[in-house]
């Protein structure tokens, strides 16, 4: 119904009011609700109205505002802090330990977190946005600092359907368009070989333990669960020969090990070239990343700290020891 | 096939030595933790020591710590518990296992050997 | 040390039955708890972890819950291959520790 100016939604009447015309809905039932676009952030329940604009929000603390869009930070809450000697004793000796491994006590002093004492360290959310990696999307943390609230605002995550298939054909050089989605890896880039690549800055260097020719020959489901994690596309870096930059890694014994070697005399060259695992250099490849999604990395850096907060939830499928950003070109090192 | 193997169990007197081993098969030792649990006749289990072979971090029991020692040797793949100082109470069969989750010992275990038995007795 | 309490100490039952074996910490663990069966003259098994997580090939008449402080490992329908000792054993924090163990005998 027609209100001079104002134009009432479907089963609104007009009211004349001191302050002018205003819509009102006598049956909210009959009437659009402003519940159905779910204005309601961070958890918050919502209410239909008679008044525009139709709904209230009952925001969860620490929320408020008419979308429960604000975040109120607790009166004075102390900053948490790792009181227990046992974390102490604990942090530094390669082992994740449950009970140390939280942001007070960074994460078992990066035993947790692939050696990554803080990984949200550019996050300035006024959230901490370690506690709210809770399968709902928290927009105060869906940023790329903050490490895009671990992909939890991607509205329902699909699962690849065929992904027994698209594992198996993953970066075959033969493009299945069953597989050529976001959730199922693009197929390894299989279907965009004629598109120009898009490498993020910098280098992901990664320590796994599984030796070259291991990692080498399962490469390809290496790089398609590390890509699943970080939602684009990685490939091994080349060096200036053309060479796959994965190399033997001979392992840096933790203070543990060095105190324990220091107590008994070690036999000559023991254990001192024995590989333990391999490096690899990777990049991040974002040609298909850019077309279907804003949630792409630039560069390296939140790359390398969204897989040492997936190493703190345990949901890493492969034995890494280590990430690091490097931003310019790396020399061969061990 | 995961496997694990001890060896190393027998009889010793009381202030005795004992070294048992446990042998693995059929994964990257180096990745897992690896437990010793042992299990007094007639009783439960009790957690012995942890290691991680990559890192060479130990953890010990109360019960054992300062008497026993864990070790691996990674070009063996084998696991150690060096146990000095034995004592009538120690006696049990000792399992060696296996930590499921990497580089967590927050996590259960989930390949076991067959098990040494251990008799500390004058 | 965290101390883990099991109850029943024992308890029999019939082939069909449905049991109920509980697992309380002495503080909160969260999720970090396994159950594993064992068979006498045998090593134990891996049931459960993460409080309702079955291992690999084991039956779907074993299910675990609980959270925090309190958990629960149920045999929907015992079948003969059943009767055993279970564990529990809390891995948040070291030393593990195990509850006292819980004999499922034949009635």
């Known amino acids: 119904s027609s209100c001079g100016q104002v134009k009432c939604r479907k089963g609104e009447q007009c009211v004349h009011t001191a302050s002018g015309p205003r819509c009102f809905c006598p049956s909210p039932r009959d009437c659009e609700s402003g519940c159905a676009s779910s204005p309601c952030q961070h958890g918050g329940s919502c209410h239909p109205q008679r008044q525009p604009p139709y709904y209230s929000c009952q925001c969860a603390p620490p929320f408020s505002g008419s979308r429960c869009e604000l975040y109120t930070a607790p009166p004075s809450t102390p900053p948490a802090t790792c009181l227990s000697q046992y974390c102490a004793d604990k942090a530094r000796d390669g082992v994740c330990d449950e009970a140390c491994n939280s942001h007070a006590c960074q994460w078992d002093g990066g035993d947790c977190s692939l050696t990554m004492e803080n990984p949200w360290a550019n996050c300035s959310s006024p959230l901490p946005c370690w506690d709210y990696i809770n399968n709902q999307c928290d927009e105060l943390c869906n940023t790329v600092e903050c490490l895009f609230d671990n992909f939890e605002c991607q509205g329902n995550s699909k699962t690849c359907k065929y992904d027994k298939y698209c594992a198996d054909h993953f970066k075959d050089n033969h493009c299945d368009q069953g597989c050529n989605s976001e959730e199922c890896g693009w197929d390894g880039l299989d279907c965009a070989a004629d598109q120009p690549e898009n490498l993020a800055e910098g280098t992901l260097v990664i320590v796994v333990l599984m030796p070259p020719e291991q990692l080498l020959q399962d490469a390809r489901s290496f790089l398609r669960a590390l890509g699943t994690l970080l939602h684009t596309n990685l490939r091994i870096k080349r060096d200036s020969q053309g060479e796959l930059m994965v190399y033997p890694y001979y392992g840096e014994k933790s203070a543990a090990m060095k105190k324990q070697r220091m107590t008994r005399r070690s036999l000559p060259g023991e254990q001192e070239q024995e590989v333990a695992g391999s490096k690899v250099f990777l990049e991040i490849d974002n040609r298909q990343c850019v077309q279907d999604s804003d949630h792409c990395f630039k560069n390296t850096d939140a790359a390398a700290a969204l897989l040492a907060s997936h190493a703190i939830q345990g949901t890493l499928s492969y034995p890494l020891v280590s990430v690091v950003s490097e931003s310019l070109t790396p020399e061969r090192t061990q | 096939e995961v496997q694990l193997v001890e060896s190393g169990g027998g009889l010793v007197q009381p202030g005795g030595s004992l070294r048992l081993s446990c042998a693995a098969s059929g994964y990257s030792f180096t990745s897992y933790g690896m437990s010793w649990v042992r299990q007094a006749p007639g009783k439960g289990l009790e957690w012995v020591s942890y290691?991680?072979?990559?890192?060479?971090?130990?953890y010990y029991a109360d019960s054992v710590k300062g008497r026993f020692t864990i070790s691996a040797d990674t070009s063996k793949n084998t696991a150690y518990l060096q146990m000095n100082s034995l004592r009538a109470e120690d006696t049990a069969v000792y399992y060696c296992a296996r930590h499921s989750g990497y580089y967590r010992i927050s996590s259960a275990m989930d390949v076991w050997g067959q098990g040494t038995l251990v008799t500390v007795s004058s | 040390d965290i101390q883990m309490t099991q109850s029943p100490s024992s308890l029999s039952a019939s082939v069909g039955d449905r049991v109920t074996i509980t697992c309380r910490a002495s503080q909160n663990i969260k999720r970090f708890l396994a159950w594993y069966q064992q068979k006498p003259g045998k090593a134990p098994k891996l049931l459960i972890y993460?409080?309702?997580t079955r291992e690999s090939g084991v039956p779907s008449r074993f299910s675990g819950s609980g959270s925090g402080t309190d958990f629960t490992l149920t045999i929907s329908s015992l079948q003969p291959e059943d009767f055993a000792t279970y564990y529990c054993?809390?891995?948040?924090?070291?030393?593990?520790?195990f509850g006292q163990g819980t004999k499922v005998e034949i009635k």
């Open positions: 290691i991680y072979p990559y890192s060479g971090a130990t």
């Open positions: 993460g409080a309702s």
């Open positions: 054993q809390q891995y948040y924090r070291s030393p593990h520790t």
